[in-house]
Interface confidence: low
């Protein structure tokens, strides 16, 4: 690989829609890993510090962000679906972690929106007590 | 897989960081429905994947669309797929 072309992913977690919760009594979190090259990543969801597989669906392969470009950067998405009551519990904590060339990137959903996000690429979510 | 009670819906999601990305989730649709790629190079749409909530014995199809475009809207995100008009759910404004 041309190491000059290595770009780590940016990872973000998107919280469930209140409309989905209201309509289905379920809550889907979406994790997006974007802008990485090459396409060697591993994505995992962690709930309360433990890796989970049930309720998880991840794209089978990364998507080229610019399909016409041979060396396009890539994106990958994943969904985690839980019950509305599980999401609503503020003690529950959700994190999406993306492994890229040994780097662990993650984003997390936190109650305190003013805290700086750590350099790790992760996405995590506390069951929201407020925003 | 066979989806027992399809209830197709498109929901708009909000990110944990103040980023410019808008995300739309298309979920709970029938397995016969196909999700088309966007003709807009600035809008990214994943293939459909199946999610299995084993503890609830519940499976659902889903696809995600996202974009950094300021005028990106969930109502038009999947416009190249055949989606009934009543699948689009409102995204309440943040009160924070």
């Amino acid at each position: 690989e041309d190491l000059k072309k290595v770009f780590p992913p940016k990872v973000a977690v998107f919280e469930p829609s209140e409309a989905e919760i209201s309509h289905t009594q379920k809550a889907t979190l979406v994790c997006l890993a974007t802008g990485f090259y090459p396409d060697h990543v591993e994505l995992s969801w962690w709930v309360n510090g433990k890796e989970v597989h049930s309720g998880v669906s991840t794209d089978p392969q990364p998507l080229k962000e610019q399909p016409a470009l041979e060396d396009s950067r890539y994106s990958l998405s994943s969904r985690l679906r839980v019950s509305a009551t599980f999401w609503h519990n503020p003690r529950n904590h959700f994190r999406c972690q993306v492994q890229f060339y040994g780097l662990s990137e993650d984003d997390e959903w936190t109650e305190d929106r003013d805290k700086p996000i750590t350099q790790k690429i992760s996405a995590e979510a506390w069951g929201r007590a407020d925003c | 897989p066979y989806i027992q009670n399809p209830d197709p819906a498109v929901y708009q999601l909000r990110g944990s960081k103040s980023n410019d990305t808008s995300v739309c989730l298309f979920t709970d649709f029938d397995s016969v429905m196909n999700v088309s790629q966007s003709k807009d190079s600035d809008v990214h749409i994943t293939d459909k994947t199946v999610l299995d909530m084993r503890s609830m014995d519940f499976k659902s199809n889903g696809a995600v669309a996202w974009s950094n475009k300021s005028d990106f809207a969930c109502t038009s995100a999947f416009k190249d797929s055949v989606i009934p008009a009543d699948t689009f759910f409102p995204s309440p404004e943040s009160s924070c």
């Epitope: 209140e18 609503h88 | 309440p92 924070c96």
Partner: nanobody, 117 residues
């Protein structure tokens, strides 16, 4: 906290109309969605209609064309106008609010609607 108080229930003949009201108090500025639900004797509670803070509405199939959900933000009140009532609409009608503050999900005590000749 959010408190919800329903009113407007009663006895009505088939084909008649009723308007239910749900008054919200407390942290109402944190509410994203209101909904009306109903529970008939011996049956599970079911959705009737939802309304978002953007006034987007969503109805159960059984309510489409007959029921209308609306809200008056200045009065913190949500209404359910029910027309062409049928005996199968007989139920305890509950107001629900979804908030951005834990515990998120609030319910009223319910108001009884009886459709009978």
């Amino acid at each position: 906290d959010v408190q919800l108080v329903e009113s407007g229930g009663g006895v009505v003949q088939p084909g008649g109309s009723l308007r239910l009201s749900c008054v919200a108090s407390g942290y109402v500025h944190k509410i994203n969605f209101y909904g009306w639900y109903r529970q008939a004797p011996g049956k599970e509670r079911e959705k009737v209609a939802h309304i978002s803070i953007g006034d987007q509405t969503d109805y159960a199939d059984s309510a489409k064309g007959r029921f209308t959900i609306s809200r008056d933000e200045s009065k913190n009140t949500v209404y359910l106008q029910m027309n062409s009532l049928r005996p199968e609409d007989t139920a305890l009608y509950y107001c629900r609010a979804l908030s951005r503050i834990w515990p998120y999900d609030y319910w009223g005590q319910g108001t009884l609607v009886t459709v009978s000749s």
